[in-house]
Interface confidence: medium
Amino acid sequence: LSEEADDTDSELGSMKPLHTFCAMKADDGPCKAMIRSYFFNMYTHQCEEFIYGGCEGNENRFDTLEECKKTCIPGYEKTAVKAASGAERPDFCFLEEDPGLCRGYMKRYLYNNQTKQCERFVYGGCLGNRNNFETLDECKKICENPVHSPSPVNEVQMSDYVTDGNTVTDRSTVNNIVVPQSPKVPRRRDYRGRPWCLQPADSGLCKASERRFYYNSATGKCHRFNYTGCGGNNNNFTTRRRCLRSCKTGLIKNKSKGVVK
């Protein structure tokens, strides 16, 4: 198996951002909301997620990944057109199968450069490489048929489609190695709100004990949980009211199918 020594995009590595504000550090501001936003990271030359507090901050803040990339990555839209026209596949499509370091059992798909097709493989649950897709369709769009692909070369970030490693919550042990469990969430077609409202409560990594609220999409209610002060996910609100206001609107009434794994 061959692997990349460095997974940053060399094509972008030497470029300067399009706007000066793209060089600013992510600034969550002084307020306490938990708003998923994106910023351009000057060091990694990628647009990355951060949590915005809801007020102040700076201009290096975008509502969507796409908007961030269009604004801050030089040549991003040209690259997108090139990929859509079938000129080239992302480099990671050519990486060989890598189940990663853990010993879980997750059904994933990779692009096989020998057969020129996307194929199923078993992913162990953490790290590994970027030739790793949750669905056959996603693999095909990005690696097999980039001619018809709406996904630009730089669009793919592992975080968009792979759940790696050990979360602090929702875990089980396989062969003495902790591996992640798929969170039990309502079917996405029954929920049209913010995607993070579907995430399970995550107490995070630190040692504090802060009262927070998370939205339970199965019940349509916001429940209390203890947050440890860092890490975790975006389904985390300082008040029940803020939680309901952010997440309740997305529930489609009378269509709940319970939970799926």
Epitope: D7, E49, M158, T163
Partner: antibody
Framework: QVQLQQSGPGLVKPSQTLSLTCAIS??????????WGWIRQSPGRGLEWLGI?????????HYAVSVKSRITINPDTSKNQFSLQLNSVTPEDTAVYYC???????????WGQGTLVTVSS | DIQMTQSPSSLSASVGDRVTITCRAS??????LAWYQQKPGKAPKLLIY???SLQSGVPSRFSGSGSGTDFTLTISSLQPEDFAVYYC?????????FGQGTKVEIK
């Protein structure tokens, strides 16, 4: 160029907590393409991997079984650094402690300068 | 845990010599192996990853080979700056583990 700068005390008393910090420049602790680990080195044990954290939409961690009950590795996104806490130390925890960056694959391509921590009363 | 055993534990060689160090894993780790060089008072430096891929900036006199359980690091023509301790590391599964090291000394 990625650089890792370690800080923390060189002497810790038995039963106390060892705390070290690793400040990152040239990369981001919450990068989607990196992982951040601690490794220690002592004459008796050689190089010993202690644990790793990484961010992929949320934070994940893996710890060595030998220290699992005593170790915490935390990110600090506001300061772009990560820390090691090792509780209830004994003289056997005396070692040079290194922080290091791993890429996707679990190989350590950048290392801190190392901190000799002596556990002694 | 996967045990990594290096041999020899030390060797003496002269500048210009071809040097070979081996690393054996206690189970099949495919090609999930790295080699590091460490000089006194310094942190280890990544030389080879994925058993045979040369890390950026590392001189081409260093090469790695092997797969499964047996791996080799070769220095084709030893230079004065190559006298150091060399370690292998597996990343096939957690916990990540290192070999005990091979010290390359001046003859």
């Amino acid at each position: 160029q990625v650089q890792l700068q370690q800080s923390g005390p060189g002497l810790v008393k038995p039963s106390q907590t060892l705390s070290l910090t690793c400040a990152i420049s040239g990369d981001s602790v919450s990068s989607n393409s990196a992982a951040w680990g601690w490794i220690r080195q002592s004459p008796g044990r050689g190089l010993e991997w202690l644990g790793i954290i990484y961010y992929r939409s949320k934070w994940y961690n893996h710890y060595a079984v030998s220290v699992k009950s005593r170790i915490t590795i935390n990110p600090d996104t506001s300061k772009n650094q990560f820390s090691l806490q090792l509780n209830s130390v004994t003289p056997e925890d005396t070692a040079v402690y290194y922080c290091a960056r791993s890429n996707w694959s679990g190989y350590f391509d950048y290392w801190g300068q190392g901190t000799l921590v002596t556990v002694s009363s | 845990d996967i045990q990594m055993t290096q041999s020899p534990s030390s060797l003496s060689a002269s500048v210009g010599d071809r040097v070979t160090i081996t690393c054996r894993a206690s189970q099949d780790i495919r090609n999930n192996l790295a080699w590091y060089q460490q000089k006194p008072g310094k942190a280890p430096k990544l030389l080879i990853y994925a058993a045979s891929s040369l890390q950026s900036g590392v001189p081409s006199r260093f090469s790695g080979s092997g797969s499964g359980t047996d791996f080799t690091l070769t220095i084709s023509s030893l230079q004065p700056e190559d006298f150091a301790v060399y370690y292998c590391q597996q990343r096939n599964g957690f916990p990540l583990t290192f070999g005990q090291g091979t010290k390359v000394e001046i003859k």
